[in-house]
């Protein structure tokens, strides 16, 4: 399982209309359930109940996002509709380019995801817990437009592909 | 079968205001982000706005401070509201799903113009 | 703001002719580019999307390539429905911004 080198970027905007960009660092982890490989694009925030929906099957989808799923207490939700795996691969069908799970509040999931798949996503499935995931999490309930890139070496340098 | 419809346009004076209205259907309007791109007939593409599915928000410059875009989930509705209306946002005004981009389904179009 | 300088502006074509249409940056970008179509009286297109990947149910005739800040759109061999407007749009760094447009006519 290795570390997945996570970069955020937000941007802000000034009152002239100018953005500015606000660069965060953080760690998680490479599952098994998907690829060791970088990949970049918007966060967009997903309620574990959102992945459940069927009525999107037939959509041309748009691609190149970063579905964030914060995962409840298994008591939460006794019978989800689909496993973590699961809802991996529905994010991943719908065109997200990378998965990460906050799975601080269900630790179990990482098993889950670590489970040796004989079919892997072809997209990184990340986990990140603690007080990464708390910075994480907190970026994205800031309801600002944000990008993540993930890499599974530290960045060189912090704005290195956010070249703004 | 997805489906965006763009309604609200209309003919205003300058320094007017409006608000555009986009109906979704078809998909679940919670789970994407929208944009706003406008056309001044058999011109070139503008981008004017766009929100993500959890309601962060960026504008082009032209109109910052001005319009402001806004979702109501539970109505499958994406808006736009358009104050101090200029004669140089006469346009034809799309609405688009997609996250960081206007992907493949966008709508017809509703007419703005602002003349005196 | 990033400037987006799309050219030609208008071309003429003959049926089965390779058509080339290029975007250039002002900029470094990466990928972030996307190519439409737009016919008249129409909503705009989604061909290609982060610059090289074609967006499902577009014919394979479309392609995209890039090379540091020089995007290009080809249509290996010019259709009578390829007749239309194209824009680039980059959605690299807001405020995003589309070129001026390429109107493809036919010769």
């Known amino acids: 399982k290795e570390t997945a080198f996570v970069e955020v970027v937000l941007f802000e905007s000034s009152p002239s209309g100018d953005y500015t960009t606000y660069t965060t660092g953080l760690t998680g982890r490479f599952s098994r359930a998907g690829a060791t490989l970088s990949a970049e694009g918007e966060i967009v925030q997903m309620h574990p109940l959102g992945l459940c929906n069927n009525n999107d099957e037939e959509d041309l989808y748009e691609y190149g996002w970063v579905g964030v799923v914060k995962l409840e207490q298994p008591e939460l939700d006794p019978k989800p509709c689909l496993t973590v795996l699961g809802k991996a691969k529905r994010a991943v069908q719908r065109g997200a380019t990378a998965v990460i799970f906050d799975v601080s509040e269900n630790p179990e999931a990482i098993d889950q995801l670590n489970q040796g798949s004989e079919d892997p996503l072809k997209r990184p499935v990340v986990y990140v817990k603690g007080a990464d995931a708390i910075k994480l999490m907190n970026i994205v309930n800031k309801q600002k437009v944000a990008r993540a890139r993930i890499q599974h070496r530290p960045p060189r340098q912090p704005t290195e592909y956010f070249d703004m | 079968e997805v489906q965006l419809v763009e309604s609200g346009g209309g003919l205003v004076q300058p320094g007017e205001s409006l608000k555009l209205s986009c109906s979704a259907s078809g998909f679940t309007f919670s789970n994407y982000g929208m944009h706003w791109i406008r056309q001044v007939p058999g011109k070139g593409l503008d981008w004017v706005a766009y929100i993500t599915n959890s309601g962060g928000s960026l504008y082009a410059a032209a109109v910052k401070g001005r319009f402001t875009i806004s979702r109501d989930n539970a109505k499958n509705t994406l808006y736009l509201e358009l104050t101090s209306l200029k004669p140089e946002d006469t346009a034809i005004y799309h609405c688009?799903?997609?996250?960081?981009?206007?992907?493949?389904?966008w709508g017809r179009g509703t007419l703005v113009t602002v003349s005196s | 703001d990033i400037q987006v300088t799309q050219s030609p502006s208008s071309l003429l074509a003959s049926l089965g002719e390779r058509v080339t249409i290029t975007c250039q940056t002002g900029q470094s970008i990466n990928n972030y580019l996307n190519w439409y179509q737009q016919r008249p009286g129409q909503a705009p297109l989604l061909l290609i999307y982060f610059a090289t990947s074609l967006q499902t149910g577009v014919p394979s005739r479309f392609s995209g390539q890039y090379s540091g800040r020089s995007f290009t759109l080809t249509i290996t061999s010019l259709e009578p429905e390829d007749i239309a407007n194209y824009f680039c749009l980059q959605h690299y760094s807001p405020p995003y911004t589309f070129g001026a447009g390429t109107k493809l006519e036919l010769r």
């Open positions: 688009a799903r997609g996250y960081s981009y206007p992907g493949p389904y």
